[in-house]
Amino acid sequence: CKAMHVAQPAVVLASSRGIASFVCEYASPGKATEVRVTVLRQADSQVTEVCAATYMMGNELTFLDDSICTGTSSGNQVNLTIQGLRAMDTGLYICKVELMYPPPYYLGIGNGTQIYVIDPEPCPDSDF
């Protein structure tokens, strides 16, 4: 018996508007009905929780109102979008998946997605 496998892309480049999207896919060993997904950021030996959501299989993924994350779920796949990113937010973003119900509980952690964020150049002043 091993830890539940979680797959995510190795690298993602955020858009010029500071938006990054990636898929987090897990190999469910059972028929979970309640799943918790957490996005963690590891950078400079610090680990912070970016966002988290618990959802019922077949239902929408709902993050807190003030969350910088949005997402949708389809089967054992979660499509995550992180907004409002700046260059200082560059780091390794890790997908943590917990199968909460019914028992038994399972935990899986992806190998992380390195998200690169490049702040856009300010627009030059215009005479127009």
Epitope: K2, A3, T38, S45, V47, P104, G108
Partner: nanobody
Framework: EVQLVESGGGLVQPGGSLRLSCAAS????????IGWFRQAPGKERETVAC??????SYADSVKGRFTISRDNAKNMVYLQMNSLRAEDTAVYYC??????????????????????WTQGTQVTVSS
Amino acid sequence: EVQLVESGGGLVQPGGSLRLSCAASGSTLDPFVIGWFRQAPGKERETVACINRSRTSYADSVKGRFTISRDNAKNMVYLQMNSLRAEDTAVYYCAASPDKPFYTDQTMCNKHYYGYWTQGTQVTVSS
């Protein structure tokens, strides 16, 4: 799936010793990092120590006093606590995390990466 059960808590005098044990069933410990954490009343749960196949890591507050070890053949992890102080009083938890290549000595014990939490065992250091 892995299931963890801890034991060994109790009341001990300052300067005394205790050994906590964490027994795993349902899986080999090999692919996991096993961590010990504690939570004192009114405080956040904090890292004590953790161990994977080849590395150990400790919170600064317990370095030199606590020793974490694992016996893969018995599927056990131990926390030997010496020179106990009143500030070590807390509920102690054992938890597991899949061992990942990006874990560093500084992050492999981070509580965010853990699951399979035990119910906790009370350790009280008092005269």
